[in-house]
């Protein structure tokens, strides 16, 4: 998990369907008792913002030590600061926990930029605004780090919610969510509603504001509107999915769909941006520029470096196009699309904004490791990580930022043929050569 772009850390919907319209799906009925409905105690349990990550409060050890932990679906280690660091207000003190057990093993996690290293152990962990359970989980006690913790982010650790295959040092280290499901009756599913503010938040506002919800073990109907549409998890390592088509304002990018998933496509709450493979990024930016051609913006803006500022309240959202990603559906030859607005992919930046200005960074960037559907995408939707049924669900988030003319959307079904061909098969490589971080 990497900072900045990769953290550890958010109708006018044109476009013809890919072919014939199929009859509209209805919401499936609950598969297991307790998986759907109301999870009042977990609603609003996240704070933060897309640029620095969303975090949940957790307790570790006996007596419990409270820490804020970044929710990261793009990694699989539960790792917490365990030594003083200039950016940490508090840290896990193993010596104060009577239930801590040392595994006598180290862990080293390098990123494209930065790294963390620490010592492995286990301890009792619970989530105060989560299920009423305590589990013994693996914990990486971070003793040294570089460019990992973010100044002012208010989180002290990271909760990797992906699968064991990408855990460090190896897949034998059971991730937290696996431990939770094994040791309790919590269903093997969680859902995330990340709520981008749509305007800059200063430090005190972030602390006071709601950042969203992580519903552990279920789906809360109050957090979304319309229907949930599911896409298969292609492989259980990252939350890998398959994108079959991309449109900008309803115009197909017309690329070989393999390009969209080269070398993978993942859903990652710990990444700020929507990150696209080089060729796809270039085509998308060209199309976004064309759609907004009445205005011309500096080169550095499209690189995600320069900020563009408008007088407060005058941001011309209408000149920027909507972006639609079509995802493989659960039914053969069926896809659905998720559509985001500029309110999602133009990220408000607080550092420079005055009462006179609203300043934004372009939050779509280039990737050399595939598509990453980061906070920019997730802030538009309620996202269900249905591990039990190996699928990810998307519905329009009840908290997404929009205007009076356009809204984010989840629509389907669409007919799409040969979707399996859109997946890229990564050549088997010695795992030691794989880069963890995504720049």
């Amino acid at each position: 998990t990497q900072h900045g772009i990769r953290l550890p850390l958010r109708s006018g919907l044109g476009g013809a369907p890919l072919g014939l319209r199929l009859p509209r799906e209805t919401d499936e009925e609950p598969e297991e008792p307790g998986r759907r409905g109301s999870f009042v105690e977990m609603v609003d349990n996240l704070r933060g913002k897309s640029g620095q990550g969303y975090y949940v409060e957790m307790t570790v050890g006996s007596p419990p030590q409270t820490l804020n932990i970044l929710v990261d679906t793009g990694s699989s280690n539960f790792a917490v600061g365990a030594a003083p660091h200039p950016f940490l207000h508090r840290y896990y003190q193993r010596q104060l926990s009577s239930t801590y057990r040392d595994l006598r093993k180290g862990v080293y996690v390098p990123y494209t930029q930065g790294k963390w290293e620490g010592e492995l152990g286990t301890d009792l962990v619970s989530i105060p605004h989560g299920p009423n359970v305590t589990v013994r989980a693996n914990i990486a006690a971070i003793t040294e780090s570089d460019k990992f913790f973010i100044n002012g982010s208010n989180w002290e650790g990271i909760l990797g919610l992906a699968y064991a295959e990408i855990a460090r040092p190896d897949d034998s280290l059971e991730p937290f969510f696996d431990s939770l499901v094994k040791q309790t009756h919590v269903p093997n599913l969680f859902s995330l509603q990340l709520c981008g503010a749509g305007f800059p938040l200063n430090q005190s506002e972030v602390l006071a504001s709601v950042g969203g919800s992580m519903i552990i073990g279920g789906i809360d109907h109050s957090l979304y509107t319309g229907s949930l549409w599911y896409t298969p998890i292609r492989r259980e390592w990252y939350y890998e999915v398959i994108i079959v088509r991309v449109e900008i304002n309803g115009q197909d990018l017309k690329m070989d769909c393999k390009e969209y998933n080269y070398d993978k496509s993942i859903v990652d709450s710990g990444t700020t941006n929507l990150r696209l493979p080089k060729k796809v990024f270039e085509a998308a930016v060209k199309s976004i520029k064309a759609a907004s051609s009445t205005e011309k913006f500096p080169d550095g803006f499209w690189l995600g470096e320069q900020l563009v500022c408008w007088q407060a309240g005058t941001t011309p959202w209408n000149i920027f196009p909507v972006i639609s990603l079509y995802l493989m559906g659960e039914v053969t030859n069926q896809s659905f699309r998720i559509t985001i607005l500029p309110q999602q992919y133009l990220r408000p930046v607080e550092d420079v904004a005055t009462s006179q200005d609203d300043c934004y960074k372009f939050a779509i960037s280039q990737s050399s490791t595939g598509t990453v559907m980061g906070a920019v995408i997730m802030e538009g939707f309620y996202v269900v990580f249905d591990r039990a049924r190996k699928r990810i669900g998307f519905a329009v988030s009840a908290c997404h930022v929009h205007d009076e003319f356009r809204t984010a959307a989840v629509e389907g079904p669409f007919v799409t043929l040969d979707m399996e061909d859109c997946g890229y098969n990564i050549p088997q490589t010695d795992e030691s050569t794989l880069m963890t971080g995504r720049a």
Epitope: S293, E295, K296, P298, D299, G300, F301, Q306, C309
Partner: antibody
Framework: QLQLQESGPGLVKPSETLSLTCTVS??????????WGWIRQPPGKGLEWIGM???????WYNPSLKSRVTISVDTSKNQFSLKLSSVTAADTAVYYC????????????WGRGTLVTVSS | EIVLTQSPATLSLSPGERATLSCRAS??????LAWYQQKPGQAPRLLIY???KRATGIPARFSGSGSGTDFTLTISSLEPEDFAVYYC??????????FGGGTKVEIK
């Protein structure tokens, strides 16, 4: 090579409208890689950005002057213009037109400037 | 709003000496900073952009460095024609409207 030249009255009465034109020669104002801007400099003081325009007509203004400023473009004449209404003595300055290049960020080519005095 | 502070206000040096001018931003501007030279009665001229890139036709004695909040313009050996006022400008926030107050390099 490309040159910019400001023109317009050197004296404007208070409360009236200051009007200046910048003529671009040696290249087309419609080339898509540039904005065209106005900057002013009161006597003995620093530089103040007024605003800029794209050949399509898209404009950006300094918020402190926005209510009084209009910048327009005439691609057929290869010119862009500045109008500043309700002027006072504080608007006395050398007015420069400039091209915004290098990734549409920096003023890489300037006119020689024209002094406009606001006085009755 | 990002404020650019230039120092010193005036720098008195002799030809052949090295001039070091500073521009400090109130917040990080990455490398999106330019330096302009203005001689009396003339328009400003772009010297350096993106903190360290020399504009077309600018002699090698002019160099820019820095990123984030602290930037430096260095003139390795002052020529008589280098005595002028120098302005920095940030374009990290766009449109490009923020200039520093200027540093005057005068003959000692």
């Amino acid at each position: 090579q490309l040159q910019l030249q400001e023109s317009g009255p050197g004296l404007v009465k208070p409360s009236e409208t200051l009007s200046l034109t910048c003529t671009v020669s040696g290249g087309s104002i419609s080339r898509g890689s540039y904005y065209w801007g106005w900057i002013r400099q009161p006597p003995g003081k620093g530089l103040e950005w007024i605003g800029m325009i794209y050949y399509s007509g898209s404009t950006w203004y300094n918020p402190s002057l926005k209510s009084r400023v209009t910048i327009s473009v005439d691609t057929s004449k290869n010119q862009f213009s500045l109008k500043l209404s309700s002027v006072t003595a504080a608007d006395t300055a050398v007015y420069y037109c400039a091209r915004v290049g290098h990734g549409i960020s920096y003023f890489d080519l300037w006119g020689r400037g024209t002094l406009v005095t606001v006085s009755s | 709003e990002i404020v650019l502070t230039q120092s010193p206000a005036t720098l008195s040096l002799s030809p052949g000496e090295r001039a070091t001018l500073s521009c400090r931003a109130s917040q990080s501007v990455s490398s999106y900073l330019a330096w302009y030279q203005q001689k009396p009665g003339q328009a400003p001229r772009l010297l350096i952009y993106d903190a360290s890139k020399r504009a077309t036709g600018i002699p090698a004695r002019f160099s820019g460095s820095g990123s984030g909040t602290d930037f430096t313009l260095t003139i390795s050996s002052l020529e008589p024609e280098d005595f002028a006022v120098y302005y920095c400008q940030q374009v990290y926030t766009w449109p490009p409207r923020t200039f520093g107050g200027g540093t005057k390099v005068e003959i000692k």
